[in-house]
């Protein structure tokens, strides 16, 4: 039996930040679980891990340098990402593993979310207005 995951098809990261909600066909309340977010078609980069243990404080970390946080809902984990770069525009996949109670469960691969990181548009300084338009 596999957990189903729903994600938004696309999100735009303005100000280099985005919130990605992973919705599961499973209630995570009072479960020990490991929710993770993966980057790339092959999910090669583990962006962020949220570890939950019986509704206690979530433990959040990234082995790949991403600034992330997580929030738990009954059937969802929302990943908050900060300081994203334009070249990190990619497809991101939610993954969930339930370790306890038995049986161990994980998810069917989701369709993923394309996160489009928009560069900040810097206003020209009044001292350096830049080239004037013709």
């Amino acid at each position: 039996n596999k957990i189903l995951v729903k994600q938004s098809p696309m999100l735009v990261a303005y100000d280099n930040a985005v919130n990605l909600s992973c919705k599961y066909s499973y209630n995570l309340f009072s479960r020990e679980f490991r929710a993770s977010l993966h980057k790339g078609l092959d999910s090669a980069v583990e962006v962020c891990v949220v570890y939950g243990n019986y509704s206690q404080q979530l433990q959040v970390y990234s082995k790949t340098g991403f600034n992330c946080d997580g929030k738990l809902g009954n059937e969802s984990v929302t990943f908050y990402l900060q300081n994203l770069y334009v070249n990190q525009t990619d497809i991101y996949f939610c993954k969930i593993e339930v370790m306890y109670p038995p049986p161990y469960l994980d998810n069917e691969k989701s369709n993923g979310t394309i996160i489009h990181v928009k560069g900040k548009h810097l206003c020209p300084s009044p001292l350096f207005p830049g080239p004037s338009k013709p």
């Epitope: 990234s62 900060q82 300081n83 770069y85």
Partner: antibody
């Protein structure tokens, strides 16, 4: 005026435990991420742990993960660091620090620090 | 993790002189860099955030510049109270990391 006051430091044997506290005042404590940063004698600053504003999530440096636990009591405006399985290399001044609302990992106000010495 | 290298380790100057401190990152941190001042026996104090923005209450003689991997903290004219340790810190990547510090001492 923002104030952060740490307490709970002292001498502890290797393998022992200690709980640090940081009493906050002068700002809406429950609205801010909080951190612990340490500084070994004569050395530089090293980030240790963080907790989000409502206490529902936390992160720890690899060197302390599984041994240290950060927590907070927003009703008491207090931040905590539970330190277990202490090692000699944990000897340091421990500072609590506030993150500004605009970013998770800058530190705009710091406490005066509390010294932990791990030695037999 | 990102390594920040500060130079020089020690800067010996007289009051009134200009101080230029450097911080180099092992990879780009965009503009997510802060500077702190620490005096002996005291807590660090935030001076500059996001490479060039002065924190509340910081005098105009302190300025920051740079982006990517190379950053500079400039103290235009040193006051007696400016002789201290200075640290840079990045928040671009997790975990946040600090440089090893530059000591500005009286010549």
């Amino acid at each position: 005026e923002v104030q952060l006051v740490e307490s709970g430091g002292g001498l502890v044997q290797p393998g022992g435990s200690l709980r640090l506290s940081c009493a906050a005042s002068g700002f809406t404590f429950s609205s801010y991420w909080m951190h612990w940063v340490r500084q070994a004698p004569g050395k530089g600053l090293v980030w240790v742990s963080r907790i989000n504003s409502d206490g529902s999530s936390a992160s720890h440096a690899d060197s302390v993960r599984g041994r240290f636990t950060i927590s907070r009591d927003n009703a008491k405006n207090t931040l905590y660091l539970q330190m277990n399985s202490l090692r000699a290399e944990d000897t340091a001044v421990y500072y609590c620090a506030r993150a500004p609302s605009s970013s998770w990992y800058d530190f705009d106000y710091w406490g005066q620090g509390t010294l932990i010495t791990v030695s037999s | 993790e990102i390594v920040l290298t500060q130079s020089p380790a020690t800067l010996s100057l007289s009051p009134g002189e200009r101080a230029t401190l450097s911080c180099r990152a092992s990879q780009s941190v965009s503009r997510y860099l802060a500077w702190y001042q620490q005096k002996p026996g005291q807590a660090p104090r935030l001076l500059i955030y996001d490479a060039s923005n002065r924190a509340t209450g910081i005098p105009a003689r302190f300025s920051g510049s740079g982006s990517g991997t190379d950053f500079t903290l400039t103290i235009s004219s040193l006051e007696p109270e400016d002789f201290a340790l200075y640290y840079c810190q990045q928040r671009s990547n997790w975990p946040p990391t600090f440089g090893q510090g530059t000591k500005v001492e009286i010549k």
